[in-house]
Amino acid sequence: RSLQDTEEKSRSFSASQADPLSDPDQMNEDKRHSQGTFTSDYSKYLDSRRAQDFVQWLMNTKRNRNNIAKRHDEFERHAEGTFTSDVSSYLEGQAAKEFIAWLVKGRGRRDFPEEVAIVEELGRRHADGSFSDEMNTILDNLAARDFINWLIQTKITDRK
């Protein structure tokens, strides 16, 4: 599938993660630029977007390994570079984000610092009550947890 075929939202996580320029005020922008934060901020923003790619890949891996995906070929297409549809719709699902936050936390801070940073942000949002608890039933599924335990203990390169 083409990148051009999607009508999904190309949205990011909350603005606080990327420390964005959220105010068009020119003086503020001058000040921030003098601190050298223009392109470095954008790099941080792209870091978070890459982490979303990782999260999506992780979700697709889990769903395919369990054979519970509605579209069972999504991970294969993603690995081939042809999967783009539904990326944002998955990521926009608050429950899915909660699930991924739970999932990634077990990976360890040193291995995936970008993902951990996002998980921490998700945790803050969760504490604020901005996440739903729709995934509780999934999290209670022991079989799924067994699979995730396997998933997070297996090196990514081993699963390719």
């Epitope: 949205r11 959220s22 923003y45 890459r50």
Partner: antibody, heavy 119, light 112 residues
């Protein structure tokens, strides 16, 4: 089909300002980040600035620090670039580009609008 | 910023022959978490805007002829045009989207 149509370019003197516009159609404009990329005559491509789907994230290349401001009006499906304190080196074709689902990847480009800075 | 360097700056290839363009990044654009290279190729014909050909280093965009192929990983990438056609005359740019986007200086492909 996706269409991006830039306007607002022209010949201006150094130090003056212009406002470039990009009218978008054929896709859900309010769902996508948008970029401006420029190309000096006979030269390569240079990324200029980005705005997220809702306008909450804005980033600029160092070369346009404090002088350029990107904005968008989702109700009008239009992207803007306010260019101030223009310099000779800002002379270029300015393209608006739609971001793909993957960040900083450009899947559609407008035809461009030429800005010439000359005294 | 990541610096992208293309070679050669220009090349002339006979119709039906193969054109090969190289692109080198000053640092890796491979994201190890998903094993994807954040590298794209664009084609720009005279008087036209760039057109996305390939993303993720090797994935053809929809509608792009299969004579175009991309390869490479990390810092070294290649765009190959098999069986060059007259309509392939253009300037080709690589671009990394791993970090603040930067482009190579372009490679002009002409008919010999």
């Amino acid at each position: 089909q996706v269409q991006l149509v830039e306007s607002g370019g022209g010949v201006v003197q150094p130090g003056r300002s212009l406002r470039l516009s990009c009218a978008a159609s054929g896709f859900a404009f309010s769902n996508y980040g948008m970029h401006w990329v420029r190309q000096a005559p006979g030269k390569g491509l240079e990324w200029v600035t980005f705005i997220s789907y809702d306008g909450s994230n804005k980033y600029y290349a160092d070369s346009v620090k404090g002088r350029f401001t990107i904005s968008r009006d989702n109700s009008k499906n239009t992207l803007y670039l306010q260019v101030n304190s223009l310099r000779a080196e800002d002379t270029a074709v300015y393209y608006c580009a739609k971001e793909a689902v993957l960040a900083a990847l450009f899947d559609y480009w407008g035809q461009g609008t030429l800005v010439t800075v000359s005294s | 910023d990541i610096v992208m360097t293309q070679s050669p700056d220009s090349l002339a290839v006979s119709l039906g022959e193969r054109a090969t363009i190289n692109c080198k990044s000053s640092q890796s654009v491979l994201y190890s978490s998903n094993n994807q290279n954040y590298l794209a190729w664009y084609q720009q014909k005279p008087g036209q805007p760039p057109k996305l050909l390939i993303y993720w280093a090797s994935t053809r965009e929809s509608g792009v002829p299969d004579r175009f192929s991309g390869s490479g990983s990390g810092t070294d990438f290649t765009l190959t045009i098999n069986s060059l056609q007259a309509e392939d005359v253009a300037v080709y740019y690589c671009q990394q989207y791993y970090s603040t986007p930067t482009f190579g200086q372009g490679t002009k492909v002409e008919i010999k």
